[in-house]
Interface confidence: low
């Protein structure tokens, strides 16, 4: 008699999570009389996925009628795959007995499942930088499979070439994580700049996942201050401004100093924000000349986002007109009672 | 049956370093993720770090800085590292076993040890 | 991070009657490989947690068909079709969905 053949046509089956997978099996006689089951894996740990004669297997069914006469082929059909289902499938005819004897497998087929990334997390980071300085930004994405993946980077659209990618882990697995780190190097108009982490895969049809940071959660931009005076209406007056520039985040407390001594402080209310996302601000005193015959140095100090003070120094300028203007018992505040304590504007 | 045991000092002074082992027995520790948690004293639980059996690590970004996790796979343990530690750091502290073979992500917490108290106290 | 938060803060209950708590995430847990990344946790009292349920619904090894739970994207609920005595303890949700890991405040579920 022909030796009977238990034929596996496929080596690998490749599934989308959710979708089902038929695995093929036929034998190549009706003889020794005997049941066939499918089990996952092999050796003693082997699960049993089929087995016509008993049990509850409501995910799997047989693709013809097994208990047909002269059928031979006992192809399986396995709905809702999860990536839990990946492994090798055999089909085993056994010989008929108490108990049933195996007799033999077929060469086996590889199920893979197909699970699409999560969508990627991106992550910046703990601390501001200031433009010129390389930042780091973290990518990551998990519980995808095949293993293949392609994760690109790009800042404002354009794609960068500098990061280095993981995939773990390296040998074989259910599923597969990515974790990318891109470096980017500031430049002062990054307030409104976006970088984007692109992850394409097989299982997301040609429409891949993205995640984004901005980098205005990455970025300090430093102010710069200039300290100018003006006269006012009144003669034995005058406005001295400190205008600061172009910084970020809004977070600024600013001192006025009369020579050396702290004179006011305030926090930066009513900004100016500029088209590259950064702000302005200005403050200004309103000085009693009278009060300041010698000289007067006032000095604007600006303490930006937690970072050590900068500042500006200017030396009153009193001409001698307004000196003129001030009685000899003229004496007061370097600012003057009517003004507000700190303008904005 | 896998099982796992947390050793280490019970008393910790401020600004030192904490360590604690955590030893699996029972079982491998290839295709996990091994995971710190800690609970101060009536409070609820946090997640400190996992690391996976390839050494990689993820840090709760609020502890990140203080926080080393690492493996030694010979000895089938892994370990946690605090840096500058604070009265704020008095917990119970557990290792636990986190599954990830399924292929989708984490899918529980499935093993912990029975935690072991850490007291931050000069 | 993501927040995790659940209600109610302490369950008196009776045995042999229902029980359900709710958890709410800050960000959806549902992602497009329709598994809610979401765990419940049971610490009883003076012991480690232990795991009730993953993905959202997945019953634990070894968990009594009488714990299930439900719920998609921010929505969870934990369920104790009939209480019994051993029930007792603190009940927290977890997210898996990334990281950190964050858990709910708890639920104090005591006997009445």
């Known amino acids: 008699e022909e030796e009977l053949q238990v034929i596996q046509p496929e080596k690998s089956v490749s599934v989308t999570a959710g979708e089902s997978a038929t695995l093929n099996c036929t034998v190549t006689s009706l003889i020794p009389v005997g049941p066939i089951q499918w089990f996952r894996g092999a050796g003693p740990g082997r699960e049993l996925i089929y087995n016509l004669k008993e049990g509850h297997f409501p995910r799997v069914t047989t693709v013809l009628d097994p208990t047909k006469r002269n059928n031979m082929d006992f192809s399986i059909h396995i709905s809702n795959i999860t990536p839990a289902d990946a492994g090798t499938y055999y089909c085993v005819k056994f010989r008929k007995g108490s108990p049933d004897v195996e007799l033999k497998s077929g060469a086996g087929t590889e199920l893979s499942v197909r699970a699409k990334p999560s969508a990627p997390v991106v992550s910046g980071p703990t601390a501001r930088a200031t433009p010129e300085h390389t930042v780091s930004f973290t990518c990551e994405s998990h519980g995808f499979s095949p293993r293949d993946i392609t994760l690109k980077w790009f800042k404002n659209g354009n794609e960068l070439s500098d990061f280095q990618t993981n995939v773990d882990p390296a040998g074989k697995s259910v599923s597969y994580s990515i974790r990318s780190t891109a470096r980017v190097v500031l430049t002062r108009r990054d307030v409104h700049s976006q970088v984007i982490c692109e992850v394409a895969h097989v299982t997301l049809q040609g429409d891949p996942l993205r995640g984004t940071a901005n980098l205005s959660e990455a970025i300090r931009v430093p102010p710069t201050l200039e300290v100018f005076q003006r006269p006012m209406r009144a003669e034995n007056q005058v406005n001295v401004t400190c205008q600061v520039r172009k910084f970020y985040p809004q977070r600024l407390l600013l001192t006025w100093l009369e020579n050396g001594n702290v004179s006011q402080t305030e926090t930066a209310s009513t900004l100016t924000e500029n088209k590259d996302g950064t702000y302005n601000w200005r403050s200004w005193l309103l000085v009693n000349t009278c009060a300041h015959r010698d000289g007067v140095v006032l000095t604007c100090q600006v303490e930006h986002d937690g970072q050590p003070a900068v500042s500006k120094s200017h030396a009153l300028e009193v001409s001698a007109h307004q000196k003129e203007q001030c009685s000899d018992t003229t004496s007061g505040p370097v600012l003057a009672p009517t003004a507000p304590l700190g303008g904005s504007g | 049956q896998v099982q796992l045991q947390e050793s280490g000092p019970g008393l910790v002074r401020p600004s030192e370093t904490l360590s604690l082992t955590c030893t699996v027995s029972?079982?491998?520790?290839?295709?996990?993720?091994w995971s710190w948690i800690r609970q101060p004293p009536g409070k609820g639980l946090e997640w400190m770090g996992f690391?996976?059996?390839?050494?990689?690590?993820f840090y709760n970004p609020s502890l990140k800085s203080r926080v080393t996790i690492s493996l030694d796979m010979s000895m089938n343990q892994f370990s946690l590292k605090m840096t500058s530690v604070t009265a704020a750091d008095t917990a119970v502290y557990y290792c636990?076993?986190?599954?990830?073979?399924?292929?989708?992500?984490?899918?529980?917490?499935?093993?912990w040890g029975q935690g072991t108290t850490v007291t931050v106290s000069s | 991070d993501i927040v995790m938060t659940q209600s109610p803060l302490s369950l008196p209950v009776t045995p042999g009657e229902p029980a359900s708590i709710s958890c709410k995430s800050s960000?959806?847990?549902?992602?497009?490989?329709?598994?809610?990344?979401l765990d419940w946790y049971l610490q009883r009292p003076g012991q480690s947690p232990q795991l009730l349920i993953y993905l959202g619904s997945n019953r634990a090894s070894g968990v009594p068909d009488r714990f299930s739970g439900s719920g998609s994207g921010t929505d969870f609920t934990l369920k104790i079709s009939r209480v019994e005595a051993e029930d007792v303890g603190v009940y927290y949700c977890?997210?898996?969905?990334?990281?950190?890991?964050?858990f709910g405040g708890g639920t104090k579920v005591e006997i009445k």
């Open positions: 029972g079982g491998s520790i290839r295709n996990y993720y």
């Open positions: 960000q959806s847990l549902l992602y497009s490989n329709a598994y809610n990344y």
């Open positions: 636990a076993r986190v599954r990830a073979y399924s292929g989708i992500g984490l899918d529980g917490t499935d093993v």
């Open positions: 690391i996976y059996d390839n050494g990689r690590t």
């Open positions: 977890m997210q898996a969905l990334q990281t950190p890991l964050t």
